[in-house]
Interface confidence: low
């Protein structure tokens, strides 16, 4: 019942041309390229492309033909190469064309850079737009995979194909529309936020195969299919983890198109084996297939079996434990895990981990000892602190949330994480906190079965972010080593780090405190970045400042901003009394 | 994969009609969308009408109200009815079908609009 076993193909590259059609297979080319070359022009990777797809349908017409028969690695490989300008660009990167395939490619894995030195995508009006789509709608889209892919070069390609499809949707409605704007600009909105989550989604993904390895992503992979599909057999959910392993592993290896093929064989099974797997496909299994494959992925979860046994049973109780666990270890621990994740759909994946990981080193422990089963007897009372932990944790950051609103939690929080890991840069420290506060909105809503899940998963997704951003420029021992010993104990790691008492308070710079008439013409949330970029700065220089302190002085601030974007005369106004703000902060911090 | 045949172009006057067929045969359950595009010798290859499994249609401005396109599921047919033809109307136009992107082509069909 293997997917992917496929017959051996003379070409490679024809198989997945003819496999994708020549659309995808020039789009998918288009986001390889640009996810490894980040810097170069998008007329560059056009033509790379071209060039590429002009070759594949030469071995379409004749897979015999000279060159056919390599590698697409070889192939890509070969044609980044060719990029003239790549040393001056992208300086030691260069020296990845001087090896042989395989490290050729792992070496331009290495240089991917999760924030690469880009210009912020600016929004044109709307008109502009329009009109740039109906004249080379193909180049419009082309344009938007390009400026996607090369700032987010993990992300899940097929996916992106999807966003593209959203994407071209949106404009072909709403650029008939009589009001363009309001009908675009909402869409381009929701597209613009799920993109960036989708995006730090499958980073983790990423993370988990390249800093922990398959068992690891393999774990996490049972967790969440076992809760997702807990009417399935463990057989089937181990042939769909196997399956979406390969799949990811392709994707974040940059071998899109393998991947991109291979994720549409696993929907196409999914949905042949509907009955065997998931009672809730049925909807998502009549769409076309990119929408298929990202509804199969979004799918609720299934409702539990009645009357599913004790866990305890075959798990603690029986003599057969520690034969079971020696005889095949991974397979025992990842019935556990299924067993376990299918009756808690309540649970965050990242916990069951923790559960499976104490259960392992339980039998570790015990089935070397003069009577196993009075030693692992217990094992189901160690879970209970391990649990109770992130319900706790959910509870307090809830009621808080609950009380400050949005903006003010995320306040809370960029005090809390600046004041913990001080080294990291101010913007990391931002963009971290703020995504770390969105879980308020996120998740506080749901009923108690329900926010567990949310707000624990969503937090390691954005937990790697900063492990990800910080592992470009090391500043912190405290956060490499969260982020480095064990990935489902980032988050408790991070929980625990208290105030960092070896920081040195920064040196006070009144310009960073200085601010211009140009705020007043910000969005809300640039100029909420602009307060908490302060906020984080104050911070830096009195790590030891209250709550009430930091409260009075960002009231102060507010109240400065609202002044003087009111003043006819607003850069005197932030000038002058700018300089007030700035003396009466030093003041009340005592600086 | 997906064979798409154009046929009906050839030579009319300006302000003259025209009606383009596209017949589509092999894995045809797969298509969702439909669409004629035209490349004039010399230009960009341009979007000239989509239409949706569903029925939903769009045009680019500079054809609206003059063509139109339809599909004949049945006969796994698509159509381009072309009224007010004028000069720069002038180019191949070819049939295109996909799932997601009309990522399959027909060989074209000449539209020559000349007095």
């Known amino acids: 019942r293997g997917v992917f076993r496929r017959d051996a193909h003379k070409s490679e590259v024809a198989h997945r041309f003819k496999d994708l059609g020549e659309e995808n297979f020039k789009a998918l080319v288009l986001i390889a390229f640009a996810q490894y070359l980040q810097q170069c022009p998008f007329e560059d990777h056009v033509k790379l492309v071209n060039e590429v797809t002009e070759f594949a349908k030469t071995c379409v017409a004749d897979e015999s033909a000279e060159n056919c028969d390599k590698s697409l690695h070889t192939l890509f490989g070969d044609k980044l190469c060719t990029v003239a300008t790549l040393r001056e660009t992208y300086g030691e990167m260069a020296d990845c064309c001087a090896k042989q395939e395989p490290e050729r490619n792992e070496c331009f894995l290495q240089h991917k850079d999760d924030n690469p030195n880009l210009p912020r995508l600016v929004r044109p009006e709307v008109d502009v737009m329009c009109t740039a789509f109906h004249d080379n709608e193909e180049t419009f889209l082309k344009k938007y995979l390009y400026e996607i892919a090369r700032r987010h070069p993990y992300f899940y390609a097929p996916e992106l194909l999807f966003f593209a499809k959203r994407y071209k949707a949106a404009f072909t409605e709403c650029c008939q529309a009589a009001d363009k704007a309001a009908c675009l600009l909402p869409k381009l909105d929701e597209l613009r936020d799920e993109g960036k989550a989708s995006s730090a989604k499958q980073r983790l993904k990423c993370a988990s195969l390249q800093k922990f390895g398959e068992r690891a992503f393999k774990a996490w992979a049972v967790a969440r299919l076992s809760q997702r599909f807990p009417k399935a057999e463990f057989a089937e959910v181990s042939k769909l983890v196997t399956d979406l392993t390969k799949v990811h592993t392709e994707c974040c290896h940059g071998d899109l198109l393998e991947c991109a093929d291979d994720r549409a064989d696993l929907a196409k099974y999914i949905c042949e084996n509907q009955d065997s797997i998931s009672s809730k496909l049925k909807e998502c299994c009549e769409k076309p297939l990119l929408e298929k494959s990202h509804c199969i992925a979004e799918v609720e979860n299934d409702e539990m079996p009645a009357d599913l046994p004790s866990l305890a049973a075959d798990f603690v109780e029986s003599k057969d434990v520690c034969k079971n666990y020696a005889e095949a270890k991974d397979v025992f621990l990842g019935m556990f895990l299924y067993e376990y994740a299918r009756r808690h759909p309540d649970y965050s994946v990242v916990l069951l981990l923790r559960l499976a990981k104490t259960y392992e080193t339980t039998l570790e422990k015990c089935c070397a000892a003069a009577d196993p089963h009075e030693c692992y007897a217990k094992v189901f009372d160690e879970f209970k602190p391990l649990v109770e932990e992130p319900q706790n944790l959910i509870k307090q950051n809830c009621e808080l949330f609950e009380q400050l609103g949005e903006y003010k939690f995320q306040n809370a929080l960029l005090v809390r994480y600046t004041k913990k890991v001080p080294q990291v840069s101010t913007p990391t420290l931002v963009e971290v906190s703020r995504n770390l506060g969105k879980v308020g909105s996120k998740c506080c809503k749901h009923p108690e079965a329900k926010r567990m899940p949310c707000a624990e998963d969503y937090l390691s997704v954005v937990l790697n972010q900063l492990c990800v951003l910080h592992e470009k420029t090391p500043v912190s021992d405290r956060v490499t080593k969260c982020c480095t010993e064990s990935l489902v104990n980032r988050r408790p790691c991070f929980s625990a780090l208290e105030v960092d008492e070896t920081y040195v308070p920064k040196e006070f710079n009144a310009e960073t405190f200085t601010f211009h008439a140009d705020i007043c013409t910000l969005s809300e949330k640039e100029r909420q970045i602009k307060k908490q970029t302060a906020l984080v700065e104050l911070v830096k220089h009195k790590p030891k400042a209250t709550k009430e302190q930091l409260k009075a002085v960002m009231d102060d601030f507010a109240a400065f901003v609202e002044k003087c974007c009111k003043a006819d005369d607003k850069e005197t106004c932030f000038a002058e009394e700018g300089k007030k703000l700035v003396a009466a902060s030093q003041a009340a911090l005592g600086l | 994969q997906v064979q798409l045949v154009e046929s009906g172009g050839g030579l009319v006057q300006p302000g003259g009609s025209l009606r383009l067929s596209c017949a589509a045969s092999?894995?045809?359950?797969?298509?969702?969308?439909m669409a004629w595009y035209r490349q004039a010798p010399g230009k960009q290859r341009e979007f000239v009408a989509r239409?949706?499994?569903?029925?939903?249609?769009n045009y680019p401005d500079s054809v609206k109200g003059r063509f139109t396109i339809s599909r004949d599921n049945s006969k796994n047919t698509l159509y381009l009815q072309m009224n007010s033809l004028r000069a720069e109307d002038t180019a191949v136009y070819y049939c295109?079908?996909?799932?997601?992107?009309?990522?399959?082509w027909g060989q074209g069909t000449l539209v020559t609009v000349s007095s």
């Open positions: 295109a079908a996909g799932p997601v992107w009309e990522q399959f």
């Open positions: 092999g894995s045809i359950e797969s298509i969702n969308r």
């Open positions: 239409i949706s499994k569903g029925g939903s249609t």
